[in-house]
Interface confidence: low
């Protein structure tokens, strides 16, 4: 899969929606210049392609939604990489430009005669892509042509800025919300000194920025902050891990505003460096409850606490997806490649026959084996439905009493569609209300997950809490079998009575040494000792001073008893 030839999935229709999914992994560092993508992806790729195709079938067969109008699509591969996604978006735009020129009769043949050739229908909107950095680049292009974009997992806070990203909307909340949720978890367990890691790129950078800002306001100190690319080499991850160990045993908690593959890189480095069990990873929704992050490295991931966007599995998608077979599924051009990759076998007689697999695929193979639904499936489907409802509302207002596309909707005006989309609200696939605020964002609801060893060599994610619009609920007993097991991540222990904190030059406010006040001093505040005035003495609890009662000697009082040093 290189830059020369890109595969596209098509589905015909009266209105065409574009989609960008990461069908393949991003190019490795050495392949970036060629834009040569990595291996095929199931959850983030193939499942999302199939979700788009099948959801459109459901919409088209629903008599109440866009009656007499068929929705089609054009799905392209973003490879979770800006350059590839931009290249693909230009293809969307090119189709739109040619189509609009046709509408205006501007397309003529070389000999001057008019053309009877009809090019592809324009793309009215785009679903995706998944990554925030990639979504920003794509939006920069799409908004020039008034093409609305609805994202299903791009959560960067920057995308809320409508002056910069006018045509961008999303069915997920902004990362400001999960940064808050992460800080609330850190606060809950009294972790005041944590290390921080984020994925280079917009998602990680803006998310970590928010986490650090909120942490500072809550008196939480960051031991050190590091950044790394998901596709960085082993040496880079090893180097990062070694830096993190330099903050042990104080900063045991590592807050990771990271893409899933960054977390995997960290886990792999922990294995190489034998650091399993030394850290507790607190991960953002890039990790969530993904098995492709932890597979093979479960021991290193144990104890991890992660944030997951609330999105239950979609049963009807599984009913459809699990029946798919390579010999009958021809509309998904990546399916045969995926099948071979998934089962590590060769599909004989298919053009994408891959010689790297020696074994021929058995006809009894089924997707039911080890099936895991994409954790963001509900959002992908909601994004597609949002586009359909937006178009439906637009049709109702522009073509009253008319079933189908009236002239007022030809061609579809992106500005009017955006207006209609922003007003859209409907019941989502999981029964929750889908609506958009003035920034095109959706409300924040998260599940808190914990990766645990459930039995010998059996590991899994369990739901241990939720964060809903500012309220954190956690089942502490599920995370920690007993209170004494709660990991400590503090730089300095509290000072004892009569001691003050002395913060060393250049140290953060969470790291101090405890120094006792002098004999005639009391603790004025946690950083200052003050001498009692003449004639007074510190109280027993050293919080203030008491006057020393004056005693006058009278005749007849016994003499004071002076002892020699030699007296025992």
């Amino acid at each position: 899969q290189s830059s020369e030839r890109r595969v596209v999935a098509h589905m015909p229709g009266d209105i065409i929606i574009g989609a960008l999914f990461s069908v393949h992994h991003q190019p490795t560092v050495d392949k970036v210049h060629e834009r040569k993508c990595g291996a095929v992806r199931e959850q983030y790729g193939i499942q999302r392609v199939e979700a788009m195709l099948h959801t459109l079938e459901r919409i088209n067969s629903d008599p109440t939604l866009l009656p007499n109008i068929t929705l089609g699509c054009e799905i392209r591969d973003s490879c979770w990489h800006s350059a590839v996604a931009l290249e693909q978006s230009i293809e969307f735009i090119r189709d739109s430009l040619i189509s609009s020129e046709e509408e205006e009769g501007l397309v003529r043949c070389v000999d001057g005669s008019s053309s009877s050739f009809r090019s592809k229908k324009p793309i009215v909107g785009v679903i995706g892509p998944g990554s925030s950095s990639v979504a920003i680049q794509v939006q920069n292009l799409l908004q020039l042509f008034n093409i609305p974009q609805i994202a299903y997992s791009a959560t960067s806070m920057d995308l809320s800025d409508k002056t910069l990203f006018k045509y961008f909307m999303r069915v997920v909340p902004s990362d400001a919300q999960q940064a808050r949720a992460m800080v609330d978890i850190v606060k809950r367990y009294n972790w005041t000194y944590v290390s921080a890691v984020h994925t280079e790129g917009n998602y990680g950078e803006s998310g970590m920025e928010a986490f650090k800002d909120m942490s500072a306001k809550e008196g939480i100190c960051i031991a050190h902050s590091y950044k790394i690319y998901s596709n960085a080499g082993e040496q880079s991850f090893d180097k990062l891990l070694k830096k993190l160990t330099s903050h042990l045993p104080k900063a045991r908690v590592v807050a990771c505003f990271c893409e899933g593959m960054t977390v995997r890189g960290l886990l792999m480095a922990m294995r190489r460096l034998g650091l399993a069990g030394e850290f507790l990873l607190l991960g953002s929704d890039g990790w969530a409850d993904r098995y492709d992050v932890t597979d093979g490295y479960q021991r290193e991931a144990v104890g991890g606490i992660t944030i997951k966007l609330q999105s239950p599995d979609v049963k009807w998608f599984d009913d459809y997806y699990l029946k798919l077979r390579p010999e009958t599924n021809h509309r998904n051009p990546w399916f045969q490649e995926f099948w071979q990759h998934r089962f590590q076998c060769r599909l004989e007689g298919f053009p994408q026959e891959n010689s790297k697999y020696n074994k021929t695929c058995d006809s009894s193979l089924t997707l039911k084996t080890h099936h895991v639904q994409d954790s963001k499936m509900g959002f992908v489907i909601n994004a597609i439905y949002s586009m359909a409802y937006g178009l439906h509302n637009m049709q109702m207002s522009l073509c009253p009493g008319y079933a189908g596309l009236c002239d007022a909707m030809k061609p579809i005006d992106g500005r009017k569609l955006l207006e209609s989309l922003m007003k859209t609200n409907f019941t989502g696939v999981s029964g929750d209300m889908i609506l958009f605020d003035e920034n095109g964002d959706s409300p924040g609801r998260y599940e808190i997950m914990n990766f645990k060893e459930m039995g010998k060599d059996y590991f899994d994610y369990i739901n241990v809490g939720s964060w809903d619009n500012g309220e954190l609920k956690m089942d502490d007993d599920e995370v920690w079998s007993k209170k004494s097991n709660i990991i400590r991540s503090v730089c300095s222990e509290p000072c004892e009575k009569g001691q003050i904190k002395v913060i060393r030059k250049g140290e953060v406010s969470c790291c101090w040494t405890c120094t006792p006040c002098k004999e005639n001093e009391y603790v004025f505040d946690e950083y200052t000792c003050k001498a009692c005035q003449l004639g007074s003495w510190p109280t027993d609890d050293l919080t203030g001073c008491d006057l020393i009662p004056v005693q006058y000697l009278r005749w007849g009082d016994p003499e004071p008893d002076y002892k020699d040093d030699d007296d025992k």
């Epitope: 650091l275 399993a276 030394e278 021991r299």
Partner: antibody, heavy 120, light 109 residues
């Protein structure tokens, strides 16, 4: 039953070269392990030499072994240890061992060892 | 490289008794320590990994503890079959290298 079997040991002259092979049976390296070599001089303690990660072929060496010893995964069931510039101090029983980490989880499967004698 | 110092070199105890073997690392190795039992003519057998985790099939009479630089292996209710040489193995993550202790010979009377 999972087993490791070392071969290739024997008598070699000082300055010579020898390649030891560790063959796994009942184990498929696609499960990703660390395959390591440990040696034990007669009547002495254990000495770690090197490990190879079967997932990507990454190698890890004791500082004294770098340059003279080369560990590699040669197939889905074999690992080799190539030893050059051998001296009498290299006389030992060489064990092949398997672990889940380079060292952090210990080695839970060992071969019976192969004896290497360096002598003129 | 990391250096592992094991004490004592030899220890004698009666059946039913308890033996304690200590292992000290020259640098902090966190919990990265394993204990092995080796009998003459046999390869080592893993007893404990990550300082305190009992390998499956190993009796609970074997107990590992410690972290950082100081580690201990305690064998209680000694049996004749426990007579062997015991080795600690430390793993230093910063240099990705291992080192074994010199070994402790346990004699059971």
């Amino acid at each position: 039953q999972q087993q490791l079997e070392e071969s290739g040991g024997g008598l070699v002259k000082p300055g010579g070269t020898l390649t030891l092979t560790c063959k796994a049976s009942g184990i498929d390296f696609s499960g990703y392990y660390y395959m390591c070599w440990v040696r034990q001089a007669p009547g002495k303690g254990l000495e770690w030499i090197a490990c190879v990660y079967t997932g990507d072929g990454g190698t890890y060496y004791a500082s004294w072994a770098k340059g003279r010893f080369t560990i590699s995964k040669t197939s889905s069931t074999t690992v080799t240890l190539q030893m050059t510039s051998l001296t009498a101090a290299d006389t030992a029983t060489y064990f092949c061992a398997r672990g889940s980490g380079v060292g952090s989880y210990g080695y839970n499967l060992w071969g019976q060892g192969t004896l290497v004698t360096v002598s003129s | 490289d990391i250096v592992m110092t094991q004490t004592p070199a030899s220890v004698e105890a009666a059946v039913g008794g308890t033996v304690t073997i200590k292992c000290q690392a020259s640098e902090s190795i966190y919990s990265n320590l394993a204990w092995y039992q080796q009998k003459p003519g046999q390869p080592p057998k893993l007893l404990i990994y990550r300082a305190s985790n009992l390998e499956s099939g190993v009796p609970s009479r074997f107990k590992g503890s410690g972290s950082g630089t100081e580690f201990t292996l305690t064998i209680s209710d000694l049996e004749c079959a426990d007579a062997a040489t015991y080795y600690c193995q430390g793993y230093y993550a910063i240099t990705t290298t291992n080192a074994f202790g010199g070994g402790t010979e346990v004699v059971v009377k």
